[in-house]
């Protein structure tokens, strides 16, 4: 029977900068029941506080609700593992909520084949930002990425959409059924999970030739003229 091994705080995530959760990995239990507590202080503060909510985030977690989430403060936290034989502490982790945001996936992805008489056909997709994100405050800039593939293909084709919530793709294989997904990330932070797949059948008469693979400003439409060279660089096949 031994004191517990050193725990490790391995992840902190926020869905929207308004709340966040941190998770830790227990060390070895030393063969005895072990209690864990997370304590923290905000940078510049001389007091220590205990985790406000050990329940919401599941086992080995600490959840900070709205009333405990400060945007412009660094949190300094550590986990203490204790059993009858002694204690051990994790390393301190410094957390700034601004940099740990992982949003929910975008919502309401709709995909349509557009075949205008006077222009080349294209695949048009549109989506909404996740509901927890309030873009009106200006705290957030969300970037989007789309991926699609024929149903039976192994490889995804990925396109970077910048801040747009709609996108056009020209290069598709006629007669194929495609899966389309979208994900988002804040300017600082982590990519969301991919949205649930939306399926679209590309008509057999969908005209495609090599020159259509070029994405021009004209093809992208007025709303997408702000796309940068860096963004265009992301329009590649994976």
């Amino acid at each position: 029977q031994l004191p517990p091994g050193k725990p490790e705080i391995f992840k902190c995530r926020s869905p929207n900068k308004e709340t966040f959760t941190c998770w830790w990995r227990p060390g070895t239990d030393g063969g005895l029941p072990t209690n864990y507590s997370l304590t923290y202080h905000r940078e510049g503060e001389t007091l220590m506080h205990e985790c406000p909510d050990y329940i919401t985030g599941g086992p080995n977690s600490c959840h900070f609700g709205k009333q405990y989430t400060s945007m412009w403060r660094t949190y300094v936290m550590m986990v203490n593992a204790t059993n009858q034989m002694g204690s051990s502490f994790s390393d301190e982790l410094y957390v700034d909520v601004t940099y740990i945001v992982q949003p929910d996936p975008p919502l309401e992805l709709t995909v349509e084949v557009k075949q205008p008489e006077d222009r080349k056909p294209y695949l048009w997709m549109k989506w909404s930002p996740p509901t927890l994100i309030d873009l009106k405050t200006g705290w957030f800039t969300l970037l989007y990425e789309i991926r699609l593939k024929p149903e039976k293909a192994a490889e995804w084709e990925t396109h970077f959409a910048g801040q747009q919530t709609e996108f056009k793709i020209l290069s598709l294989h006629p007669g194929q059924k495609y899966l389309v997904q979208v994900r988002c990330k804040p300017d600082h932070g982590y990519w969301s999970a991919w949205s649930p797949a939306t399926f679209i059948q590309i008509p057999s008469d969908f005209i495609m030739n090599d020159e259509q693979k070029l994405i021009s400003e004209e093809d992208l439409g007025g709303e997408q003229k702000l796309i940068s060279e860096e963004d265009l660089h992301h329009h590649h096949h994976h």
Epitope: E43, G44, L47, H49, P52, G65, K66, W72
Partner: antibody, heavy 121, light 107 residues
Framework: EVQLVESGGGVVRPGGSLRLSCVGS????????MNWVRQGPGKGLEWVSG????????NYAESVKGRFTISRDNARNSLFLQMNSLRAEDTALYYC??????????????WGPGTMVTVSS | EIVLTQSPGTLSLSPGERATLSCRAS???????LAWYRQKPGQTPRLLIY???SRATGIPDRFSGSGSGTDFSLTISRLEPEDFAVFYC????????FGPGTKVDIK
């Protein structure tokens, strides 16, 4: 309207006890750290005790540690201060005070009108 | 315990004048954790400024706060009749403490 109302003050002999109560209304009581602050007659403000909204660790000024006990009942939007072994220097107007956030150690943005405690033989 | 000292103890000014109140801490305070209050005679204190320079809800822009380290100040650009009162600074980086107050009275 956001408000706090204290009760339970009165006159007590040295060594006696009193229990102060505070009821909050017009806001989500369990979103805020809560505190007691006192002000002796003609004197300045002195923080007495406070704790975070989830009822975590309690915190006390050195002058009252071991004699006063703070507690709260979020279901009843209530904060309490049990005062034992009272001394003449505890004579003051006692304010129930809300912290701006979930932490008790924050700026105090809502104050009750206060309840007067007089310790005298 | 962090001790706060306020100066001057009393400030005698006329309505419309500018007032600058000082608050000094016994040790360095992160600027996120300093507040100012006004207490009019016979009334409860009211939060004016938090985080050294952020105005509380409903506080007019004649009040401004500044400072860092151990030296902080509250400036009232034009004194109104309701500003003749006692002003307290407070730190909340540790267990909260208040300064002894500065009384602003009419000259």
């Amino acid at each position: 309207e956001v408000q706090l109302v204290e009760s339970g003050g009165g006159v007590v002999r040295p060594g006696g006890s009193l229990r102060l109560s505070c009821v909050g209304s017009g806001f989500s009581f369990d979103d805020h750290g809560m505190n007691w602050v006192r002000q002796g007659p003609g004197k300045g403000l002195e923080w007495v005790s406070g704790f975070n909204w989830n009822g975590g660790s309690t915190n006390y000024a050195e002058s009252v540690k071991g004699r006063f006990t703070i507690s709260r009942d979020n279901a009843r939007n209530s904060l309490f201060l049990q005062m034992n072994s009272l001394r003449a220097e505890d004579t003051a107007l006692y304010y129930c005070v809300r912290g701006r956030s979930g932490w008790f150690n924050d700026a105090f943005d809502v104050w009750g009108p206060g309840t007067m405690v007089t310790v005298s033989s | 315990e962090i001790v706060l000292t306020q100066s001057p103890g009393t400030l005698s000014l006329s309505p419309g004048e500018r007032a600058t109140l000082s608050c000094r801490a016994s040790q360095t305070i992160n600027s996120n954790y300093l507040a100012w209050y006004r207490q009019k005679p016979g009334q409860t204190p009211r939060l004016l400024i938090y985080g050294t320079s952020s105005r509380a809800t409903g506080i007019p822009d004649r009040f401004s706060g500044s400072g860092s380290g151990t030296d902080f100040s509250l400036t009232i650009s034009r004194l109104e009749p309701e500003d003749f009162a006692v002003f307290y600074c407070q730190q909340y980086a540790g267990l909260p403490t208040f300064g002894p107050g500065t009384k602003v009275d009419i000259k």
